[in-house]
Interface confidence: medium
């Protein structure tokens, strides 16, 4: 579990706004609104990592914090799925996992948390600035996604602490239940923003540390927020991006999947084919300008069933039926 | 407990139109792709429509395309089938299905395939 | 589109039997295969994706096999509750197709 503090952290006002009592007055609504609007939502957070011994290989954490039980969990690069990332690989809690290169293996940390080898070597090795974004279904939460990226003065083998993940999406309404010490403090804040509503609002400096700051671009806005503030993404340095998919389908046109949920993802077909071509449901690459059908290559290394996905302090969980791992 | 439910279905006239729902519950509506598939009396199983979860993206069988409308409401947890100029042929138990994981890469779609399923509910297409 | 082919189109065995069914794509579709079971009156159950994965829950005497254009799906120990019709379903590429079904009988 993380220890970090769940509240941004503020920048005291500039020396002479306000008194010693001003202030507590002022970091408290700050601090209750957060709380007011956090309180019962799950989060993401992110890590990503390069590994010391070598330049091209990362390691990216992510770790749901909730108390639904996830469905699925998708890793990206290049930005959220739906917005130009590329699914790097999908764990399934019951179904295994199935990577795509450059990932070289994807594992289960906790019930809760995955983590995931990165490597390669030339167009389809990871950049330092390449964003990683890792999105959890669970229920009744709903999808929730965040992205980092690895700090930019940060040294080869080290990395940033976890990082909460600003609250990115939530699929289901009625999720924030606010307790009723909350709900109190909610009044509370109300009740202090009239209080001070005709006194002038002294002015803060910029937090360096808030989540809601990103630091180099870490975080990024879900799918859904993208689509709505038309956000543009534009963190992603296109040399790091996989050379299969810049390349060697030149045609690729825009997604039937348009924005990629956590288990569906990019087409490359246009609306304006989908009558006349029929479109491949696994394992293939359409060209939309002559229709014609090239396999996309292998498929995902496949791992043997034997897989525990959830370490278990009592021994290995037995799983129904083989997992079909890729 | 996961579970689908679909209504609407009945004895409707040709060419006439009739919208089928399904209920979803028990699970994360709007993380999953749908289908429908429909069963007519004494033949097998054949695939309708499908739809991404947000529902920007639909595709459907020749047999249906141009009169059927697969569209869903995530808020309600509600999948939907809306048919027009129905056929004598389209009598059918229709069923919704959840698509247990769909992924698609740029180049590749990957069904796992259906592993939810309502009761189903039945239309008759018949003068 | 994907025809897929099963046969038998019904077959009747004892309780305890070896059953197998087999399913045939027109063309190569790997693994992407799944199998159904479809009772009367009820919704459709999976039981077997990928080919040969057992779906959670189902019991061990399923089993399927297969890759390309031909697969095998085998009841090791036929149960009274295993009359059904029995379904395979590519998903190589859409539209999705099923086979046309075995239907399953106890003697």
């Known amino acids: 579990m993380r220890t970090e503090a769940q509240v941004p952290a503020l920048q005291p006002p500039e020396p002479g706004l306000e008194g010693a009592m001003g202030h507590r007055t002022l970091v408290l609504p700050w601090v209750l609104l957060t709380l007011c609007v956090t309180a019962g939502t799950p989060e993401v957070w992110v890590q990503v990592r390069m590994e010391a011994t070598e330049l091209s290989s990362f390691t990216i954490r992510c770790g749901f914090l909730g108390s639904g039980s996830i469905s699925l969990v998708t890793v990206s690069w290049g930005g959220p799925n739906g917005a130009g990332g590329t699914t790097l690989a999908v764990l399934h809690p019951e179904r295994g996992i199935r990577q795509w290169a450059p990932a070289r293996q994807a594992r289960w940390e906790t019930q809760s948390s995955i983590s995931l080898i990165l490597e390669g070597s030339g167009a389809s090795s990871p950049c330092a600035n390449t964003t990683f974004c890792c999105k959890f279904a669970s229920f009744p939460e709903g999808s929730w996604e965040a992205c980092g990226s690895l700090p930019p003065s940060s040294d080869p083998g080290l990395s940033a602490p976890p990082t909460p993940a600003p609250i990115l999406r939530a699929d289901l309404a009625g999720i924030l239940g606010v307790s009723g010490v909350l709900l109190f403090g909610c009044v509370y804040l109300l009740h202090l923003l009239r209080r001070h509503k005709h006194r002038p609002a002294p002015r803060l400096q910029p937090s360096r540390t808030s989540p809601q700051a990103p630091r180099a671009r870490a975080w990024a806005p879900s799918q859904a927020s993208q689509a709505a503030l038309h956000v543009p993404y534009a963190t992603i340095n296109t040399s790091c991006r996989p050379a299969t998919l810049d390349t060697a389908h030149p045609h690729g046109g825009p997604s039937w999947w348009a924005s990629l949920p956590t288990h569906a993802a990019h087409r490359p077909q246009g609306p304006a084919a989908w009558a006349s071509t029929p479109i491949p449901a696994r394992g293939s690459f359409v060209s939309v300008e002559n229709g014609l059908y090239a396999q996309a290559g292998e498929r995902p290394p496949h791992t043997g069933p034997g897989l525990t996905l959830f370490p278990d302090p009592r021994g290995p969980r037995a799983m129904e039926g083989p997992l079909g791992v890729r | 407990e996961v579970q689908l439910v679909e209504t609407g279905g009945g004895l409707i006239q040709p060419g006439r139109s009739l919208r089928l729902s399904c209920a979803a519950s028990?699970?994360?509506?709007?993380?999953?792709?749908m289908h429908w598939v429909r069963q007519a009396p004494g033949k097998g199983l054949e695939w309708v429509a499908v739809?991404?979860?947000?529902?920007?993206?639909?595709y459907y069988a020749d047999s249906v395309k141009g009169r059927f409308t697969i569209s869903r409401d995530n808020s309600k947890n509600t999948l939907y089938l809306q048919m027009n100029s129905l056929r004598a042929e389209d009598t059918a138990v229709y069923y919704c299905?959840?698509?247990?994981?769909?992924?698609?890469?740029?180049?590749?779609?990957?069904?796992?395939?259906?592993?939810?399923w309502g009761q189903g509910t039945t239309v008759t297409v018949s003068s | 589109d994907i025809q897929m082919t099963q046969s038998p189109s019904s077959l009747s065995a004892s309780v305890g039997d070896r059953v197998t069914v087999t399913c045939q794509a027109s063309?190569?579709?790997?693994?992407?295969l799944n199998w159904y079971q479809k009772k009367p009156g009820k919704a459709p159950k999976l039981l077997i994706y990928?080919?040969?994965n057992l779906e959670a829950g189902v019991p061990s005497r399923f089993s399927g096999s297969g890759s390309g254009t031909d697969f095998t799906f085998t009841i090791s120990g036929l149960q009274p509750e295993d009359v059904a019709t029995y379904y395979c379903?590519?998903?190589?590429?859409?539209?999705?197709?099923f086979g046309q079904g075995t239907r399953l009988e106890i003697k």
């Open positions: 299905a959840r698509d247990v994981m769909v992924y698609c890469s740029s180049t590749s779609c990957y069904f796992y395939g259906m592993d939810v």
């Open positions: 028990g699970f994360t509506f709007s993380s999953y792709a």
């Open positions: 739809i991404s979860y947000d529902g920007s993206n639909k």
């Open positions: 063309q190569d579709i790997r693994d992407y």
């Open positions: 990928d080919a040969s």
């Open positions: 379903q590519q998903f190589e590429n859409l539209p999705i197709t």
